[in-house]
């Protein structure tokens, strides 16, 4: 019986460990500044790091600029987006800027895209100041199904701060779907 | 066998409970306004409450102004920093302010400090308005090792809002490292 | 013994699953724009969706404009509040706005209300620009007891963005209280 109990304990430990790790996908993706699109209109950001510096991914997939869910569950999603401009970078086309982020979910089965979270601000970035900066943070709790894709859209991508501590997004699984 | 099963169940319940609690360190630290440094340049904030009001800590340590990790894991880190100024507090030296927060990680083994997250905004706080306010929120998911330290740096610390609901930072463990 | 082991495994699987699901209440509530109060002073927002679009709730209750905790625990709470104004909506009474959110906790046993988190900004929304936008995000980790209620207060409710991706708040349980 003692051996049997050890076996029960052992198998349970495996199962508990395995299910715990399997149950908790995550990703933290940081901006890849070598490939930021230009322009001031809303664009999808497709270049992110997933395996250098603070960037990491587990039990999720990064492909074609999108974070792909591999496991059904409820996830906490977040994004931090920083915009900046220094006068040495040249003159802005307009002082009135709309600095925005949109976190979107795309379902391949039903090819449609929906915005889960948005944030940002209109800003007046006057030439009287040599430096301007603004950050947006959004976060929320969402049900995600395997195969669904998360992507980030921003306005004024050419103003993005390329630092890994500045412009990033991520997700981590909190619980299963009942 | 029934007794044996009860023993298995009991030991498992203990193990499950124990491992669950041990696996989830957390902290929510609120600003200690009795000791806010002056100046407008970037400074490290070292005075935080950990055991009064909303402030609390478990399986982590607060020492020398830093939040110390006691247990390896993936943690969600967050900070909320509020700045404010009322004309009755005195006249500002400049209308052009850079109100920023930096969440940094320090490793004692390799004595180096790295910024995990940053946020903030340049603001124009004119004397034409009697009150000014601005809040920053940042959050992200990071791998932390036992012994690593988290600290908060801000610009313009004398403008910090001293309320516990305004200026705080925290962390909670989400999962083990595989 | 094999049958006994299966029984142990089975009962454990049930217990593990049940305790896991019971232990993780959550809510993500989105603004119900059909019933937003007017005015510019601080008001409590009582109309939220809990079961349409991104809105959802489990093991928590939404009643009388408040999110009610059904299970003791440590929760991560968050809110995202967007304000916007287009010149076609009419003229603002003042260009100097205080756009704020307060996440409050009310205990019925001790009838008192306390602010857990606040965020926002003073803004100058001039008539020189046709569109203005601003978003606030706050988040933090709090101990909540069964029966306690979470509510949202904002200034200038008539400027709220009514989209489900813009104005929402939520909570999810991270761990039990020791």
């Amino acid at each position: 019986i003692r051996a049997e109990k050890a076996m029960v304990d052992g198998s349970w430990l495996d199962l508990a460990k395995r299910s715990k790790l399997e149950a908790q996908p995550f990703a933290h993706l940081t901006i890849n500044a070598t490939d930021i699109p230009s322009g001031s209109h809303k664009v999808s950001l497709s270049s992110w790091y997933h395996d250098r510096g603070w960037a990491k991914i587990s039990n999720m997939t990064f492909s074609n600029g999108k974070l792909i869910v591999n496991q059904d569950g409820f996830y906490y999603l977040y994004a931090n987006i920083c915009f900046r401009h220094h006068e040495t970078s040249g003159d802005l086309a307009t002082e009135y800027l709309q600095l925005m982020v949109y976190v979107t979910k795309t379902s391949i089965k039903i090819p449609s895209s929906h915005t889960l979270m948005k944030g940002g601000s209109t800003k007046y970035w006057s030439g009287n100041s040599e430096f301007h900066f603004y950050s947006i943070n959004v976060g929320g709790f969402f049900k995600l199904r395997s195969g669904e894709e998360i992507s980030i859209e921003v306005s004024n991508p050419s103003l993005l701060d390329p630092d890994q501590d500045a412009t990033y997004f991520g997700a981590f699984k909190v619980r299963d779907i009942d | 066998i029934r007794a044996e099963k009860a023993m298995v169940d009991g030991s498992w319940l203990d193990l499950a409970k124990r491992s669950k609690l041990e696996a989830q360190p957390f902290a929510h630290l609120t600003i200690n306004a009795t000791d806010i440094p002056s100046g407008s340049h970037k400074v490290s904030l070292s005075s935080w409450y950990h055991d009064r009001g909303w402030a609390k800590i478990s399986n982590m340590t607060f020492s020398n102004g830093k939040l110390i990790v006691n247990q390896d894991g993936f943690y969600y880190l967050y900070a909320n920093i509020c700045f404010r100024h009322h004309e009755t507090s005195g006249d500002l030296a400049t209308e052009y302010l850079q109100l920023m927060v930096y969440v940094t990680k320090t490793s004692i083994k390799i004595p180096s400090s790295h910024t995990l997250m940053k946020g903030g905004s340049t603001k124009y706080w004119s004397g034409n308005s009697e009150f000014h306010f601005y809040s920053i929120n940042v959050g992200g998911f990071f791998k932390l090792r036992s012994g690593e330290e988290i600290s908060i740096e801000v610009s313009n610390p004398s403008l910090l809002d001293p309320d516990q609901d305004a200026t705080y930072f925290g962390a909670f463990k989400v999962r083990d490292i595989d | 013994i094999r049958a006994e082991k299966a029984m142990v495994d089975g009962s454990w699987l049930d217990l593990a699953k049940r305790s896991k699901l019971e232990a993780q209440p959550f809510a993500h509530l989105t603004i119900n724009a059909t019933d937003i109060p007017s005015g510019s002073h601080k008001v409590s927002l009582s109309s939220w969706y809990h079961d349409r679009g991104w809105a959802k709730i489990s093991n928590m209750t939404f009643s009388n404009g408040k999110l009610i905790v059904n299970q003791d625990g440590f929760y991560y709470l968050y809110a995202n509040i967007c304000f916007r104004h287009h010149e076609t909506s009419g003229d603002l009474a003042t260009e100097y706005l205080q756009l704020m959110v307060y996440v409050t906790k009310t205990s019925i046993k001790i009838p008192s209300s306390h602010t857990l988190m606040k965020g926002g900004s003073t803004k100058y929304w001039s008539g020189n620009s046709e569109f203005h936008f601003y978003s606030i995000n706050v988040g933090g980790f709090f101990k909540l007891r069964s029966g306690e209620e979470i509510s949202i207060e904002v200034s200038n409710p008539s400027l709220l963005d009514p989209d489900q991706d813009a104005t929402y708040f939520g909570a999810f349980k991270v761990r039990d209280i020791d």
């Epitope: - | 002056s38 100046g39 407008s40 500002l92 030296a93 400049t94 209308e95 313009n156 004398s158 403008l159 | -």
Partner: nanobody, 128 residues
Framework: EVQLVESGGGLVQSGGSLRLSCAAA??????????MGWFRQAPGKEREFVAA????????GYVDSVKDRFTISRDNTKNTMYLQMASLKPEDTAVYYC???????????????????WGQGTQVTVSS
């Protein structure tokens, strides 16, 4: 290097007015980056703070004895600061110095040691 040059001093009767100017020059000087202030030193006394103005000109601070009589202002396009002095009194007699500094605190600096650059001063004499 930043150079500050005061002008506009002179002899005036009690109750009269004067307008002091402080012109800033220097290869790297940009007025909008500097807090500016006026100090004065009466014969046999320590140099004292009179008034200061924020980089953009919307925040001003004064010593109590000159409030409602003196007005500090600036024109960043001309790299110049002014001190309009009215209802002058004999006790306002002093050498008036212009000072400038990049902000190192959130609030207007009021002590001498907080200022980096100084002018040579201009004499103001108020006769009774």
């Amino acid at each position: 290097e930043v150079q500050l040059v005061e002008s506009g001093g002179g002899l005036v009767q009690s109750g009269g007015s004067l307008r002091l100017s402080c012109a800033a020059a220097g290869y790297t000087f940009r007025a909008r980056a500097y807090v500016m202030g006026w100090f004065r030193q009466a014969p046999g006394k320590e140099r004292e703070f009179v008034a200061a103005i924020s980089t953009g000109g919307t925040w001003t601070g004064y010593v109590d004895s000159v409030k409602d009589r003196f007005t500090i202002s600036r024109d960043n396009t001309k790299n110049t600061m002014y001190l309009q002095m009215a209802s002058l009194k004999p006790e306002d007699t002093a050498v008036y110095y212009c000072a400038a500094t990049t902000p190192s605190t959130s609030y207007l600096p009021r002590s001498e040691r907080q200022y980096e650059y100084w002018g040579q001063g201009t004499q103001v004499t108020v006769s009774s």
